[in-house]
């Protein structure tokens, strides 16, 4: 992937607005949108002034760690969906848009320079991630579309403007 | 102890310029940003805007976006907030606040600001 | 833009317990930050991430946030917590939103 791609704004919109419309989708659905468990999936909130004031690389970490989980998470639901005697139609398809999404996001980080969380020397500092659970297809896709909204978003923002310098 | 202490209180006519100050003592200034706030006679808050000292970033609230300008300077651990054209309906309670994890964790006394023919 | 929608008024009997609510759109999903205000006086920040307490605020203040939802509840009353209450919230984007103000009366 080009090195800068992901400081595209357009780049990160794309994906954003994928994740949305498949919360939207799945918004309307109940007991066919269950996950019939809860999966673990990092916690979405922000801070604002305190993300702010995050080391940058304190920023990759939780960052790094967040796609982790989520992509973890998106999987797992792959696998509920796939052992569901009547899956609600629309959602395998959405599943796949946010399970290539997350492989995409990952390889544009990696080209912006993003080292990945095990490698980064803040990592064994780092606070253990906030998690918190998803037991529908649409929390899921809702935790997809506001990690991307918020703290990838914030980080690639940053990342970006250090990379102009 | 933390203290924002802001400039007194004004009466202006519609048209005029205005500058109001917020100067920070008992912490470092440019480790936090610096919000700013109106109240309407007998209304709620409202976010204005704020700004990070230290990087010169500023956010204002679309509400407010080019009807005021925020500033710093952090030699003298103050922040300002300005109109170059005052109106009737900016009559109102400017507060300042320090903007930390703990959101407006500590406030000015407020500057009274009166706009009348 | 982002909108919180608070009750103009809530009262409360001595000793009782007081819930303030705000709601907007997936609030859970925010943090969301109380403040009391009393005539007068500057706003005071007596919730913040939800439902952390800063110092010199009293235990009988406490916060809770999920769906479209962040309530206040005070519970022992006393009068002295007669005041305006206000909610507010980061967006990812950086603004701060205040609810509209909760007017707290303590009966009696």
């Known amino acids: 992937a080009p090195p800068r791609l992901i400081c595209d704004s357009r780049v990160l919109e794309r994906y954003l607005l994928e994740a949305k419309e498949a919360e939207n989708v799945t918004m309307g659905c109940s007991e066919s949108c269950s996950l019939n468990e809860n999966i673990t999936v990092p916690d979405t909130k922000v801070n604002f002034y305190a993300w702010k004031r995050m080391e940058v690389g304190q920023q990759a970490v939780e960052v790094w760690q967040g796609l982790a989980l989520l992509s973890e998470a998106v999987l797992r639901g792959q696998a509920v969906l796939a052992n569901s005697s009547q899956p609600f139609e629309p959602l395998q398809l959405h599943m796949d848009k946010a399970i290539s999404g997350l492989r995409s996001i990952t390889t544009l980080l990696r080209a912006l320079g993003a080292q990945e969380a095990i490698s980064l020397p803040d990592a064994a500092s780092a606070a253990p991630l906030r998690t918190i659970t998803a037991d529908t297809f649409c929390k899921l896709f809702r935790v997809y579309s506001n990690f991307l909204r918020g703290k990838l978003k914030l980080y690639t923002g940053e990342a970006c403007r250090r990379g102009d310098r | 102890e933390v203290q924002l202490v802001q400039s007194g209180a004004e009466v202006k006519k519609p048209g005029e310029s205005l500058k109001i100050s917020c100067k920070g003592s008992g912490y470092s200034f440019t480790s936090y940003w610096i919000g700013w706030v109106r109240q309407m006679p007998g209304k709620g808050l409202e976010w204005m805007g704020w700004i990070d000292p230290y990087r010169s970033e500023i956010r204002y609230s679309p509400s407010f976006q080019g009807q005021v300008t925020i500033s710093a300077d952090k030699s003298i651990s103050t922040a300002y907030l300005q109109w170059s054209s005052l109106k009737a309906s900016d009559t109102a309670m400017y507060y300042c606040a320090r903007v930390s994890s703990e959101p407006f964790d500590s406030w000015g006394q407020g500057t009274l600001v009166t706009v009348s023919s | 833009s982002y909108v919180l929608t608070q009750p103009p008024s809530v009262s409360v009997a001595p000793g009782k317990t007081a819930r303030i609510t705000c709601s907007g759109d997936?609030?859970?999903?925010?943090?969301a930050y109380w403040y009391q205000q009393k005539p007068g006086q500057a706003p005071v920040l007596v919730i913040y991430d939800d439902s952390k307490r800063p110092s010199g605020i009293p235990e009988r203040f406490s916060g809770s946030n999920s769906g479209n939802t962040a309530t206040l509840t005070i519970s022992r009353v006393e009068a002295g917590d007669e005041a305006d209450y206000y909610c507010a919230t980061w967006t990812f984007e950086g603004d701060y939103v205040f609810g509209g103000g909760t007017k707290l009366t303590v009966l009696g």
């Open positions: 997936k609030l859970g999903d925010h943090y």
